[in-house]
Interface confidence: medium
Amino acid sequence: DAHKSEVAHRFKDLGEENFKALVLIAFAQYLQQCPFEDHVKLVNEVTEFAKTCVADESAENCDKSLHTLFGDKLCTVATLRETYGEMADCCAKQEPERNECFLQHKDDNPNLPRLVRPEVDVMCTAFHDNEETFLKKYLYEIARRHPYFYAPELLFFAKRYKAAFTECCQAADKAACLLPKLDELRDEGKASSAKQRLKCASLQKFGERAFKAWAVARLSQRFPKAEFAEVSKLVTDLTKVHTECCHGDLLECADDRADLAKYICENQDSISSKLKECCEKPLLEKSHCIAEVENDEMPADLPSLAADFVESKDVCKNYAEAKDVFLGMFLYEYARRHPDYSVVLLLRLAKTYETTLEKCCAAADPHECYAKVFDEFKPLVEEPQNLIKQNCELFEQLGEYKFQNALLVRYTKKVPQVSTPTLVEVSRNLGKVGSKCCKHPEAKRMPCAEDYLSVVLNQLCVLHEKTPVSDRVTKCCTESLVNRRPCFSALEVDETYVPKEFNAETFTFHADICTLSEKERQIKKQTALVELVKHKPKATKEQLKAVMDDFAAFVEKCCKADDKETCFAEEGKKLVAASQAALGL
């Protein structure tokens, strides 16, 4: 429905608080280097303007699109050229090219300082002194570091962030109350950001059809009692929501997400029996809850799929009539019967089915040609099952840290050109699949593990896209969204790689390592491990283990020494020499 003033429409729908928060998120995701105060000023100006439009929708400029209004506002930033370089050229363009230009300049790895958590008392004072500014700062800092963070979900995180401070700043032991909550929010936030980044990559790199296929599979698993009609409607609406958020249309996205949650709750009887509790919650919690809701029970006595999709003589006629609808129904029917499969596996099966029909429906005897199509599924199903079994066994044997190290070595050998920080980050996250998924029974392992790996490998893909260094990474990332994980799994040691020159500085450590958290210390050691493999890609597991054990002993020894710095200097030289000898460097 057309509104005279889009900005007034969204302001009224969302309310002032959410409107301001979403505009701040949008601006921070576009201009990631701008100071907080500058963004707050821009947001206040937009909000005041929106209020004039609410009062009179015919007022000057109120009929302009949100992209025009927001883009004009961003282009008033005085230091645009100095801070952002060529992004300033976007401002010479007209809409919609200008917004596309801003989107292309979003940086997945912005050069921003790590967020350091102040002392609890300092945070509580800041919270009490100016709660509004404190919460805005949270939105700003997350949004600029995660330019694709799902905006309506960030509002939910901010609500929980506020609740944590409200409760814990009054507690007897503030730190004991607050720190675990902040850790949980940080970890959940990183996971949420990565999941949304995959959705945006899916839409932007592979198109709406790819996203819709993913959504059909996932929603059919989650709502197996819902009819195809209902799933199709939800997929259409969900695609609109994510297209908007990934496109920077955060006000429309949040508004449409609220409408979708309302629809789902009004029609839960025909969608899922698991939605009751979610639907009793306030809006932000409700939307989050629906997005995370457990799979409903499968209807009893679902008939075999073979009759309709293989044995029927009408398969080619039905396929030709409306290809995507027919394939959508196949995916829906297969997915609702298989909550034990990963979404990417279901999509591989659907792709195999599609390829078979394309070939067979042009053959002399189509039915004879596609009669055995379901047999082709067997190896596709067994491959991830076997991989997960092997890796869960390895995880149980090694524990998380050493399992991460095994993956670090594996991936550094596959793609040694990738930067060390990226290899460490991605391999550490790949390694978390063990503690996240291996505890589950067999029926839940594959959807947990393979769909999580898709999210992590997408991080590698988006980071690599910024500065491409490996043709193999580019190939695995761009050829097929659903085959990314099998593509990386199939990579062997890169025989074309010329080992990195040895640099003693890379392996020089100082006393500051002793004051680091356990996690930070692990990252230091894992960084050294990647560098070792880059220097000696043919090193055996045993050689690398010996060097890493020596390294761990060296750090432990020097951190206990009276003169730590001297110990690191002297013992470090010995360690480097011994490592070189052990690895034949």
Epitope: E227, F228, A229, S232, K233, T236, S270, P303, A307, D308, F309, S312, D314, V315, K317, N318, E321, A322, V325, F326, G328, M329, E333
Partner: nanobody, 128 residues
Amino acid sequence: QLQVVESGGGLVQAGGSLRLSCAASERTFVAYAMGWFRQAPEKEREFVAGISWFAGATTDYADSVEGRFTISRDNAKNTAYLQMNNLKPEDTAVYYCAISHQLPGGRPGRDMDSYSYWGHGTQVTVSS
């Protein structure tokens, strides 16, 4: 929610014709089976005709209308039709359009329970 709206009913003399239309609001209309049912005063609702989800792949008719009524659909317009010829006074009833999701190979069910979405009906009166 999927909306179903019937139209085309009216008063007609015996032996005459009417064409009922059923418009569905969803763009995925192609993925549904379509059925026409009718309910005469003091009688139970009964199956009249059905068509499976792809253009005329399978049609089915009640014995009482076979040869006189023709069901068809236009996927591009999200609309289904019931062409009723040689109408009889016993065809007088409220005619309901119903839409169902079902597997593509199946016949359009005669059972009311297999249809999820229903219109409010359109009155057809055949005078003698």
